[in-house]
Structures are given as structure tokens and as C-alpha cells.
């Protein structure tokens, strides 16, 4: 849903959320293009691209939250993700530089679609929270009480280290979206029931 417009239909909304999380756990949409663009597509370098522990809530943590807490945690985490993705975008090569070095412009376009897609997911998370009468959550187009700050990597001037940090973050992000998808898959057919 765009611009904060919300569906009142639970099953439709849940279906959208499941579809969005399915797409977002797909590494071919974000991590793989990032690895290619940043020249990390070498076995030795790929080994260094591991998820940083604690960067994202675990599936176990998410499952233990209950619907309300889960949606609030997801909303806050997606806020952090938007910042990290914007930060990564700032340091990507420009389109003309990619063309000069023979890299695929489509990879850059995939990376630049990530933030709007996260925004769309976050809007649906807000809508689902409204549907479940969770009035604590900030409306997507209004400022919140402050985005909870992530365990941000110490800013580094080392370009290679920055690339690896980006890679680790994206690996964690895809894993997190996989966990989110699994939690949503357990939600029941109505707002009031949950399959166990």
C-alpha cells in the first residue's frame, strides 16, 4: 500500500506481507548484486561476508514476542534497515562508472529498489498493526519517537572494510526476512487466531 493507505482486509494484508517477505529474503535481489558491484565475487572474499551476530533479532526472539511485539520490533528494525540501505547506496559506484568498468547496470537498479520495497513492507506492517488495534506504532509518514539505533559498525575510512560490513549487513537482512516470513506463515486465517 502506498502513502499510508491501509487495506482493512486481514487475509489480503497478511498475503501481501508474506509475498513481500518472500521477495526480500531472495539474495538475488540485493546481496548478490551488491557482491558483484563491489567486486567481492571471489571465493576468498565471500568467506568474509558473514552475518554479524546480534545485528538482527533471531527467529527464536521474534517467535517469542507475540503479534503486537513482533510488529513493533519489525517496524523498528525496518527503520534501521532503511538507514543502512541509504548509507550503502551513498557509497555505491555511479551508473556511468559501472558502465565504464563493464559491470551490470541492472545490479545497481536492483540495489536502488531495495529501499522503496522496504518502505512498502513497513507500510503494510503499520497497516497490520492498525488492524490488530496496535495504536502504539508511529504512522509511516509522521516522525516517530526516534528510530531505535542499531549496533552500527564504527565508521571506517577503509573502503574494503566498508564493503565487507555492507555485505555482512545484507546477509543478516536476508536471514532476518526469512525469519520474518516464517513467523508470518504461522499466523492464522483471522486477526484473532494464531496457528501453533
Amino acid at each position: 500500500a502506498a502513502m499510508g493507505s491501509c487495506s482493512k482486509e486481514y487475509r489480503m494484508l497478511l498475503g501481501q506481507l508474506q509475498k513481500q517477505t518472500d521477495l526480500m529474503q531472495d539474495t538475488s535481489r540485493l546481496l548478490d548484486p551488491y557482491i558483484r558491484i563491489q567486486g567481492l565475487d571471489i571465493p576468498k572474499l565471500r568467506e568474509h561476508c558473514r552475518e554479524s551476530p546480534g545485528a538482527f533479532p533471531s527467529e527464536e526472539t521474534l517467535r517469542g514476542l507475540g503479534r503486537r511485539g513482533f510488529l513493533q520490533t519489525l517496524n523498528a528494525t525496518l527503520g534501521r534497515v532503511l538507514h543502512r540501505l541509504a548509507d550503502l547506496e551513498q557509497h555505491l559506484p555511479k551508473a556511468q562508472d559501472l558502465e565504464r568498468s563493464g559491470l551490470n547496470i541492472e545490479d545497481l537498479e536492483k540495489l536502488q529498489m531495495a529501499r522503496p520495497n522496504v518502505l512498502g513492507l513497513r507500510n503494510n506492517v503499520y497497516c497490520m498493526a492498525q488492524l490488530l488495534d496496535n495504536s502504539d506504532m508511529t504512522e509511516p509518514t509522521k516522525a516517530g519517537r526516534g528510530t531505535p539505533q542499531p549496533p552500527t559498525p564504527t565508521p571506517t575510512s577503509d573502503v574494503f572494510q566498508r564493503k565487507l560490513e555492507g555485505c555482512s549487513f545484507l546477509r543478516g537482512y536476508h536471514r532476518f526476512m526469512h525469519s520474518v516470513g516464517r513467523v508470518f506463515s504461522k499466523w492464522g486465517e483471522s486477526p484473532n487466531r494464531s496457528r501453533r
Partner: antibody
């Protein structure tokens, strides 16, 4: 009343430094990302830098990155712009602006009246 | 960087007549159903003031003679019935990616 008041502008020589401040009042400062936007005399508007609500993330215009540093002190409801290695082309009125809307896709809904920075020998 | 091209550079319109300002982006500033385009008004000696956000949403307190439309690369600000107080320079702004960039401005005057 929601208000932003800039200070710290003035005349500085090329290569010199200046620190701009923006005092915010009338709203929960720590809940908003904040930006600096500049306007050269008789010219259009140019976004310069943005800082996230908690201060962990910063975004810069390419030709100021490495020379300018945006920062904030939420306890003091203040935004700053440290400008080093100033050039003649940095001459402009610098506006402090509040960011609203979708995270990282903001627009600016409240602006200060601006402070003039003149870089000249 | 996304380049925003505004047209015309200046516009003279009679009181009560319609004024139309266009803004074209060098690449799409829309994605996933969102239009990341905003419109500002700036009067001499004053800071800019937001009129329209996300292409078509009227900012609170702005008269409804102002409206915005468009998606992708082409956007329009319309003043349905120009008033004396609308004399100003109008700017478009995209926030699709960093750096955010403004259009060059359109000066609106009374004919």
C-alpha cells in the same frame, strides 16, 4: 511554536573553517532527522547534508563530503554543521530544516530563516 | 545524481488565471507505488515553504488552489486561480535517493 534558528555564519577566507548551529524549539527534536540546505546568492536551493534522528547516520552532498560534518546534540535540541576547507563556491545562505515523511525519503517541512556564509579573501 | 529540470523558468499569469509549472527528473523518482517528489514556494527574503509532498498531498494550511500531480519522471504543480500573494519562486525537490536535488526554480509573476 515550532522554530529553527541558525547562527554562526560570517565572512571567512578560502581554506578556513566555520561552525554553524541551529537551535530547535517547539517540537520533540530527538524524533526527527534534520538537514542543512543552502542557497547561493540569487541562485536555487541545494541540499547539503542530513543526519538521522539519533545521530547514527549521516548523508552528504558529494562535493562537501570530507569537508563538512553534520552533527547533533539531542540533549541541547541543537544541530551543527562543521565546515572546513571552505571554498568560494560554498558562499550561500545556509538553512536548517526539519525532515518529515518516510524514513530516508524525507521532505523538509520546517525551515529556519538561514545564516549567511561568505567565503572570500 | 538525478537532475531536476523545471519549466518554464518564469511565468506571468493574470490574477484568477491558472498557473502550471512542470518538473522533469532525469530518471524515475517513483518506486513501489510511492512518488518521491515535493513542491516548495519561496518568497523574497524568506525561507522556502512546503506546498505539496509526495507529488499530490497538500501540506496542512496550504490553500487548496495548489495541487500536484504526476509520477515517474514528469510532475506538475498547478495553481488553479492565481492570487497576488502567490508571487514567488517555486521549486520541485526529489527525495528518491541521495543526493536529494531541487529543480532550478520557476518565478511566477502577475501579468
Amino acid at each position: 511554536e515550532v522554530q529553527l534558528v541558525e547562527s554562526g555564519g560570517g565572512l571567512v577566507q578560502p581554506g578556513g573553517s566555520l561552525r554553524l548551529s541551529c537551535a530547535a524549539s517547539g517540537f520533540t527534536f530527538s524524533s526527527y532527522a534534520m538537514s542543512w540546505v543552502r542557497q547561493a546568492p540569487g541562485k536555487g536551493l541545494e541540499w547539503v547534508a542530513t543526519i538521522s534522528d539519533g545521530g547514527s547516520f549521516t548523508y552528504y552532498l558529494d562535493n562537501v563530503r570530507g569537508r563538512f560534518t553534520i552533527s547533533r546534540d539531542n540533549a541541547k535540541n541543537s544541530l551543527y554543521l562543521q565546515m572546513n576547507s571552505l571554498r568560494a563556491e560554498d558562499t550561500a545562505v545556509y538553512y536548517c530544516a526539519r525532515d518529515v515523511g518516510h524514513t530516508t525519503f524525507w521532505y523538509f517541512d520546517v525551515w529556519g530563516r538561514g545564516t549567511l556564509v561568505t567565503v572570500s579573501s | 545524481d538525478i537532475v531536476m529540470t523545471q519549466s518554464p523558468d518564469s511565468l506571468a499569469v493574470s490574477l484568477g488565471e491558472r498557473a502550471t509549472i512542470n518538473c522533469r527528473a532525469s530518471k524515475s523518482v517513483s518506486a513501489a507505488g510511492y512518488n518521491f517528489m515535493h513542491w516548495y514556494q519561496q518568497k523574497p527574503g524568506q525561507p522556502p515553504k512546503v506546498l505539496i509532498y509526495y507529488a499530490s498531498n497538500l501540506e496542512s494550511g496550504v490553500p487548496d488552489r495548489f495541487s500536484g500531480s504526476g509520477s515517474g519522471t514528469d510532475f506538475t504543480l498547478t495553481i488553479s486561480s492565481l492570487q497576488a500573494e502567490d508571487v514567488a519562486v517555486y521549486y520541485c525537490l526529489h527525495s528518491r535517493e541521495f543526493p536529494f536535488t531541487f529543480g532550478g526554480g520557476t518565478k511566477v509573476e502577475i501579468k
